[in-house]
């Protein structure tokens, strides 16, 4: 048999909370549980839906779970089923509405002395209590004029009057909670003693010095009293006029008029109604002075033959909107055809050369007018005046490349060279005509040049060879102080290069033969062991046909190459103690000697009282300290080699004394003892 | 068209001196060793002086050194010679030229006679 | 001072022949070796420079030569316009030298 341990109860529910129905089976075999609501069995949804047995309800609705919902368990092998008693909710709710007119039955019914009853549309469970109020202000039951009906959630004023008139609202609470009404009713009684606006003032704009006028009219039983203020609230009247407004008129029908408004006048004109009862009422309009300011220039434009464009005007800002139209050669354009103004545009279609000009665009006001123009050009294809032409350039000199075309707009000369694009830098200029500049042609400049003319409507190209013609030179020139080992074998090379291979050879400076011990061999002078007597000045002479002669003097030194007599060596000295770094190199010249420590070189001037280099070169540091420790380089040259060596210097701390060492024991390493 | 031509001869008297001139036209001059060479009568060509294309270095034969001095003005394309002790074996054909790629002017004579 | 040794001293040749004139200098001279030929009353005119460059102008049967300090210059198929005086100069080591000349008939 089928037993329901927990079955479903009625409960209270707040519409639109959390809720659930519970149900819980025992049985012998396997069962099936599922709900009905009013004998139909219940779909899941999001909202309502099976948990386990029991029902549960994500938002409980008060339409769609209204009915009596059961729990039935069924096993589908007997067929036996049983059902849970019946359940329902009992759902608290508020719903807010709109306050409307119950009587009369329209708004256009309503006069002053009748009852007029409002309806508060908040309806709910249990059934709330009802708050009226009139802009803002709650109204309490047995007010006089009026009484509050709760059960029909009615309002009614009887008999209505004046001061009745204003904005009706409710609200309405009830154990669920509280809603106010979602739309409201303006109650508007007419009293023929509160002024009412027949005219109102409008904003004005005028030009300076013109007239402005502003009409102001109200209607009430007595008539109503009408005011004009000024911006800084100064009366305006016939007799007392503020200083600004020397020239205002009012009218006795509420006009006022502004004769030879100027900018001090701008600004907000009230017109202030007031009748025998009721708020004044008060009107508010601008008078502006009329402005125009200057336009936006435009850049000079161009087109494309066959082309379609388009030219903005953007119209200056101004009081009122300026209007916009665009001339040309004095006659306004059209708004259709092939040149026509469409907008604020300018447009051209199917471009013609004959476009070309000037075209104007105007803006116009009560302040006056402005006038803007463009200078449109329609653009030609470069034609030649001279293509750039195959060329000799002298290396050295400047060369010029011609490329020089015609069209409109001017055209855009840019140059290759093999091609990449010349960049201008300090080698290569384009002038204002396309002309090419090579400030100084060297010899890799003889290659292929292409020049091209551009405009917006296409461009032309030319190229042209360049061959450069070699200058005579020396490659690379001799250096002009040169050294050569005594008792050793030397060379000393020159080589030329020019338009035609040039024939080379030395001669001493003096116009005098070359010994015979020393040869010439294409340009290569040859020493086969060099004496004292080879020093001296030499010449090298390149020649050729073309070209004529080159020299390059050239002054040789014999000397015997730097060697170390005496070299550092490593050392290792007590801190405090002096350390002596020796050095002695010989040479022709005599060589000099200079020292290097921690990676600079030590200024004999600059050395300071520690450090002292002798004149055999020996370098001595008196009262040695860590940071004295590195690497010492001694460095001798002269006019013609220079030769380093190296040693490191260490600094250590003198060691204690242990007992068991005798007092001659000798240190670890080699040292320096003073 | 290079041209070289040589002005200034004429007889003169052993002992006496004379100046040559070159006046040179039709090449870049400052480019160019310039030298003299004569040509006596029914002999050979004979070297006498040679100038470097600055200017800065003179080359003469022997038995014209102390005599005779060679010089140029290369902003007036010019090219001298001047003469001193002058001696009657110093008879021949002066001709101006550019040393090794010869353009050679049409030759002064100069005589030396008493 | 460099020696310059022209031979012959004189030469005659049939149009058309080949004809080889010599110049030895007495040390290296390197390429500094050019060739001149002079008509009877005109200046000399230079026909070779740099021992083998032919100079603007000269007809192509004109070449030179070197071995060593040895100079040759040979003219293809002689023409009646070349007949006059051959000089060779060593422009190599001042005092410049002059060949003493070779005179060119024909016959």
């Known amino acids: 048999a089928i037993v329901f341990i927990k079955q479903p109860s009625s409960q209270d529910a707040l519409q639109g909370r959390r809720a659930l129905l519970r149900c819980e089976v025992e049985a012998p075999g396997p069962v099936h549980v599922y709900w009905l609501l009013d004998g139909a069995p219940v779909q899941d949804t999001e909202r309502r839906f099976a948990q386990g047995s029991s029902l549960s309800f994500a938002a409980v609705d008060r339409l769609q779970d209204s009915g009596t919902f059961q729990c039935v368990a069924r096993d589908d092998v007997t067929g036996e089923e049983a059902r849970s008693a019946n359940a329902s909710f009992n759902i608290k709710w508020i719903e807010a509405g709109p306050v409307v007119l119950k009587h009369p039955a329209s708004e256009a019914e309503i006069q002053p002395q009748t009852q007029v009853t409002l309806r508060c549309h908040i309806d709910g469970h249990p059934r709330p209590t009802y708050q009226w109020f009139r802009d803002g202000t709650p109204l309490s039951d047995g007010q006089s004029n009026h009484t509050v009906s709760s059960k029909e959630r009615n309002l009614t004023l009887r008999p209505a009057g004046p001061e009745h008139s204003g904005l009706y609202s409710c609200c309405a609470h009830s154990a669920f909670g509280q809603a106010c009404s979602s739309q409201n009713f303006t109650l508007s009684i007419a009293d023929e003693s509160f002024a009412r606006v027949v005219l109102a003032p409008q904003d004005v704009v005028v030009a300076r010095y013109e007239e402005a006028m502003f009409h102001c009219q109200f209607s009430a039983q007595p008539p109503p009293s009408l005011q004009w203020l000024f911006e800084d609230e100064t009366p305006i009247t016939n007799r007392s006029r503020p200083p600004h407004l020397r020239r205002a008129t009012v009218f006795a029908n509420g006009s006022l008029l502004l004769t030879q408004v100027r900018p001090r006048n701008a600004g907000i004109y009230r017109c202030i109604g007031q009748g025998q009862r009721g708020p004044p009422i008060i009107l508010e309009a601008t008078l502006h002075l009329a402005e125009i300011e200057d336009m936006p220039l435009f850049e000079p434009r161009v087109f494309t033959a066959g082309s379609e464009e388009r030219v903005t005007c953007l119209p200056p800002k101004g009081l009122p909107e300026p209007s916009v139209w665009w001339e040309h050669a004095g006659v306004r354009l059209p708004t259709h055809g092939r040149v026509y103004q469409k907008g604020h545009e300018l447009v051209l279609a199917n471009i013609a050369e004959s476009d070309a000009g000037v075209y104007t665009c105007h803006a116009a006001n009560l302040a006056g007018q402005r006038r803007q123009d463009v200078n449109i050009t329609v653009a030609t294809v470069p034609s030649w005046l001279k293509k750039p032409q195959d060329s000799q350039l002298e290396e050295g000199k400047p060369g010029y490349l011609d490329c020089l075309t015609q069209a409109t707009p001017k055209p855009t000369v840019v140059w290759y060279r093999n091609q990449m694009l010349i960049s201008e830098d300090s080698r290569f200029e384009v002038f204002k005509n396309g002309t090419l500049r090579i400030n100084s042609v060297e010899v890799y400049d003889g290659t292929w040049y292409r020049c091209m003319s551009s405009t917006p409507a296409g461009s032309i190209e030319a190229q042209a060879r360049v061959q450069v013609l070699e200058k005579l030179k020396f490659t690379p020139p001799p250096q002009p102080q040169q050294c050569m080992e005594f008792d050793k074998e030397a060379t000393v090379p020159c080589s030329a290069t020019g338009r035609e291979k040039p024939t080379i050879k030395w001669e001493r400076a003096d116009g005098s033969s070359l010994p015979e011990w020393v040869t010439d061999n294409a340009g290569t002078l040859h020493f086969a062991r060099v004496t004292r007597d080879d020093a001296g000045n030499y010449t090298c002479i390149a020649s050729n046909g073309p070209q004529g002669q080159i020299r390059a003097h050239v002054q040789l030194t014999v000397a015997v190459f730097i060697t170390f007599k005496v070299e550092p060596e490593r050392t290792t000295v007590y801190q405090g103690h002096t350390a002596l770094l020796q050095c002695e190199a010989q040479g022709d010249p005599k060589p000099l000697i200079q020292w290097k420590g921690k990676d600079r070189i030590l200024d004999p001037t600059k050395l300071g009282p520690r450090m002292h280099i002798f004149q055999n070169g020996s370098l001595v540091i008196h009262d040695v300290a860590p940071e004295d420790s590195g690497r010492y380089t001694c460095i001798a040259g002269n006019s013609c080699n220079i030769k380093h060596t190296e040693a490191p210097l260490y600094v250590v701390d003198k060691p204690v004394p242990e007992e068991s060492e005798g007092p001659g024991s000798p240190p670890p390493y080699k040292m320096i003892q003073t | 068209e290079v041209q070289l031509v040589e002005s200034g001869g004429g007889l003169v008297q052993p002992g006496r001196s004379m100046k040559l001139s070159c006046a040179a036209s039709?090449?870049?001059?400052?480019?160019?060793?310039m030298a003299w060479v004569r040509q006596a009568p029914t002999k050979g060509l004979e070297w006498v002086t040679s100038v470097s294309s600055d200017g800065s270095t003179t080359y003469y034969r022997d038995s014209v050194k102390g005599r005779f001095t060679i010089s140029r003005d290369n902003a007036k394309t010019t090219l001298s010679l001047q003469m001193g002790s002058l001696r009657s074996e110093d008879t021949a054909t002066y001709y101006c030229?550019?040393?090794?790629?010869?353009?050679w002017g049409q030759g002064v004579m100069v005589t030396v006679s008493s | 001072d460099i020696q310059m040794t022209q031979s012959p001293a004189s030469l005659s040749a049939s149009l058309e022949e080949i004809v080889t004139i010599t110049c030895q200098a007495s040390q290296d001279i390197g390429d500094w070796l050019s060739w001149y030929q002079q008509k009877p009353g005109k200046s000399p005119q230079l026909l070779i420079y740099?021992?083998?460059t032919l100079a603007d102008g000269v007809p192509s049967r004109f070449s030179g030569s070197r071995s060593g300090t040895q100079f040759s210059l040979k003219i293809s198929r002689l023409q009646v316009e070349d007949i006059g005086i051959y000089y060779c100069l060593q422009a190599y080591s001042a005092p410049f030298t002059f060949g003493s000349g070779t005179k060119l008939k024909i016959k």
């Open positions: 039709g090449f870049t001059f400052s480019n160019y060793d």
């Open positions: 740099g021992t083998t």
């Open positions: 030229l550019t040393l090794y790629y010869s353009h």
